[in-house]
Every structure is written in C-alpha cells, then in structure tokens.
C-alpha cells in the first residue's frame, strides 16, 4: 500500500522537516526558518510558536518539532501549552485580584502558587498538635494524649493530613 501510495502521491516521500513544494514540481523542500513539519507528507510547514515577552523559550523550534514555552522567573505556567503566565507569590501567601496577600491565621501555603489551605485538624484523627502551624507550613500532628500514658511509646509517625480544618492552638 505504501509503495502504491508513493507512486500516486510523490508528496508521501517527503520526510518530517520538509514540505512538498507545489511550486517546484512537488519536490521535497526544507522547512523555511521559524517553521516545522513534525510528520512526513506535509504540503506546508507550520509556523513555530514564538515565546515572547513573559513567555520564555523552554525548547527551541527545530525543522521537525515546535518550540515550547514556559514563563520568565516570577511567573508560572497555566493553561494548555502554557497559554498563560500567572504571577508567583511567596510561601505563606496566595494570589488575589489585587496581588499577593498573606495567608489568614489558621491557613498555610507552602508553594509559590495556589491558595492558602486550612491547617490539618489533628483532633479529627484523635491526635494532638506536635508542631504549630504557620503561614508557610501545616501543623504537625503527634500522638494522642492517651498514647502518652506511662509505658507507651512517644515516637509515633505523624498521621497523614486528611480532612482540613482549624487546629486548636
């Protein structure tokens, strides 16, 4: 079938990185600068994605593959194919329409993006607060008071954060 197809359509012989040039008796011509073809048999090459301004080139365009963008420092990608760059905040903050704001008491954010989340409520797991939470860090839950009775081991792994909630201080 491939041989039959190539006899009927000379363009099918053009590899990735080229296009079938109708203006030159359908010979395979290299993609012009700033364009690419990622598959064979193309009649045109596609224009490369241009990473301009706040978009930064993560991967250069080649004759066979498109450029890829990310965001300049201080921003992070959002959306399909990094179609948007969102402002970073510091840990302990969240992004609002008016810019970066500190997390409210009882909430934290340990990343430069995303929203402030409530501290883990240790008591929901029958645990106690081993380390208090901050704007940047969740509380660390420790053993329940009952576990600390004489003869009981005081070294137990912290319970995994489950249902968020305010932790008593």
């Amino acid at each position: 079938f491939e041989r039959t197809r190539s006899l009927q359509d000379p363009c099918s012989n053009c590899p990735a990185g080229t296009f079938c040039d109708n203006n030159r008796n359908q010979i395979c011509s290299p993609c012009p600068p700033n364009s690419f073809s990622s598959a064979g048999g193309q009649r045109t090459c596609d224009i490369c994605r241009q990473c301009k301004g706040v978009f930064r080139t993560r991967k250069e365009c080649s004759s066979t593959s498109n450029a890829e963008c990310d965001c300049t420092p201080g921003f992070h990608c959002l959306g399909a194919g990094c179609s948007m760059c969102e402002q970073d905040c510091k840990q302990g903050q969240e992004l609002t329409k008016k810019g970066c704001k500190d997390c409210c008491f009882g909430t934290f954010n340990d990343q430069k993006r995303g929203i402030c989340r409530p501290w883990t409520n240790c008591s929901l797991d029958g645990k106690s607060v081993l380390v208090n939470g901050t704007k940047e860090r969740d509380v660390v839950c420790g053993p329940s008071p009952a576990d600390l009775s004489p003869g009981a081991s005081s070294v137990t792994p912290p319970a995994p954060a489950r249902e968020p909630g305010h932790s008593p201080q």
Epitope: T44, D46, I47, C48, R49, Q50, K52, G53, V54, F55, T72, G74, F75, L78, G79, A80, G81, S83, M84, C85, E86, Q87, L95, T96, K97, K98, G99
Partner: antibody, heavy 123, light 107 residues
Framework: EVQLVESGGGLVQPGGSLRLSCAAS??????????VAWIRQAPGKGLEWIGD???????YYNPSLKSRVTISRDNSKNTLYLQLNSLRAEDTAVYYC???????????????WGQGTLVTVSS | DIQLTQSPSSLSASVGDRVTITCRAS??????LNWYQQKPGKAPKLLIY???TLQSGVPSRFSGSGSGTDFTLTISSLQPEDFATYYC?????????FGQGTKVEIK
C-alpha cells in the same frame, strides 16, 4: 485603576512623521510581566497590531511596519511612545495603546485600552 | 503570518437568542486565542483570553471554546448591550493578528 490616555493625533502630510504618546496610570510600565502595545484601526476596518514593548525594554514589531516604526517609553513619566515615519494615506487610522495581560495573569491579550487618537494622513 | 477567518461576517439576532461566532486559524495555534467586543466609536473590550478564560467583570453569558484551528465564542442569551462587532486575536506567533470581525445586529 488602570488608565491609558493617547495623545498626538491629528492631520499629517503624506511622507511626514507622527509621534504619539500614551500616558499610563494605575500601574508601572516597568513592572515585571507588563507589556504595552500599539494597535490601530483604519476607518470601517479591523484591528492591526503595530508592536509592543515589555517591562524589560524588549520590543516586537509587525514586520509589515517594522522599517517605519519605533516604540519607546519613558519610565520616569510612565509614558509610551509610537514613532511612525514615511506616512501614507493607508496609515490613516485610530491608534490605540493597550496593556497586555489581565491583573495577575499575563499573556498577549489586551484587557486595558486607551480611548484612541485619530491620525489622518492627507495633503 | 497566521490568518484568522471569522464566520459569519455579520448576523442578525434577537434579544434572548443563543449566538455562536467561529474563528478558524490558518494552522494550529493551540489555545492562544482571545475574543474582544467593540462598539462604534469605542475601544475594544476583552471578553475571553486563552481560548476559554472569562475576563474579570465579563458576564457569564459569554463563553469561549476550542483549540487547534477552530474556536467558538458563544453568547448564551443575547442582551441589548451585546449588539456590537466581535474580533478574535491570536498570540501564537508574531505578528499578533486579528480576525476580520463579526457584526452582530438586531433582527
């Protein structure tokens, strides 16, 4: 509140030059991620991107106009400029400046526009 | 340059109608597409960016969809203030380009 105010339009002779200003308020032209563009619209026609300038000072131009256009800015005045040379009748248009991006998410879309200034090229 | 072709060029509709405007790119542009509304004598107003993100303050009756080469702006229930011209714009590569516009008129 973000505001952009264009000025400098009017009647210009063919072959002459124009220098338009865009005074920005409510944000700084030098803030990271901020871009401001010039976009024009001929009477009864669609929109045409002329070019833009970023907080870094990097400029990008429409190749169809690149040989005749310069975009610059004065950070101390928070003002953007468009210089267009060798004017012809087809440069007659309303010229807008527009800020790229939204409030906290940025990209090449224009959420804030000036009111526009009309440039008429005629003898 | 990347060409954007809008259809229809104009349409007549009544208040309350569902209106759909399409924008077709000359090649794939992923989700790098925006929509604007313009009224006579006024500057354009951003409605949708990155194909489907509603700009702050824009009524939820406006929505955008699509990726690759085919994009749609939908007004779910046309209001009197929506009669205007609508433009798509790509930011996949420079020069940034706009569609030729779709005029929405009162039937």
């Amino acid at each position: 509140e973000v505001q952009l105010v264009e000025s400098g339009g009017g009647l210009v002779q063919p072959g002459g030059s124009l220098r338009l200003s865009c005074a920005a308020s409510g944000f700084s032209l030098s803030t990271s991620g901020v871009a401001v563009a010039w976009i024009r619209q001929a009477p009864g026609k669609g929109l045409e991107w002329i070019g833009d300038i970023y907080h870094s000072g990097n400029t990008y131009y429409n190749p169809s106009l690149k040989s005749r256009v310069t975009i610059s800015r004065d950070n101390s005045k928070n003002t953007l400029y468009l210089q267009l040379n060798s004017l012809r009748a087809e440069d007659t248009a309303v010229y807008y400046c527009a800020r790229g991006g939204s409030d906290t998410v940025v990209g090449d879309w224009f959420a804030y526009w000036g009111q526009g200034t009309l440039v008429t090229v005629s003898s | 340059d990347i060409q954007l072709t809008q259809s229809p060029s104009s349409l007549s509709a009544s208040v309350g109608d569902r209106v759909t405007i399409t924008c077709r790119a000359s090649q794939s542009i992923s989700s790098y597409l925006n929509w604007y509304q313009q009224k006579p004598g006024k500057a354009p107003k951003l409605l949708i960016y990155a194909a489907s993100t509603l700009q702050s303050g824009v009524p939820s009756r406006f929505s955008g969809s699509g990726s690759g080469t085919d994009f749609t702006l939908t007004i779910s229930s046309l209001q009197p203030e929506d009669f205007a011209t609508y433009y798509c714009q790509q930011y996949y590569s420079t020069p940034l380009t706009f569609g030729q516009g779709t005029k929405v008129e009162i039937k």
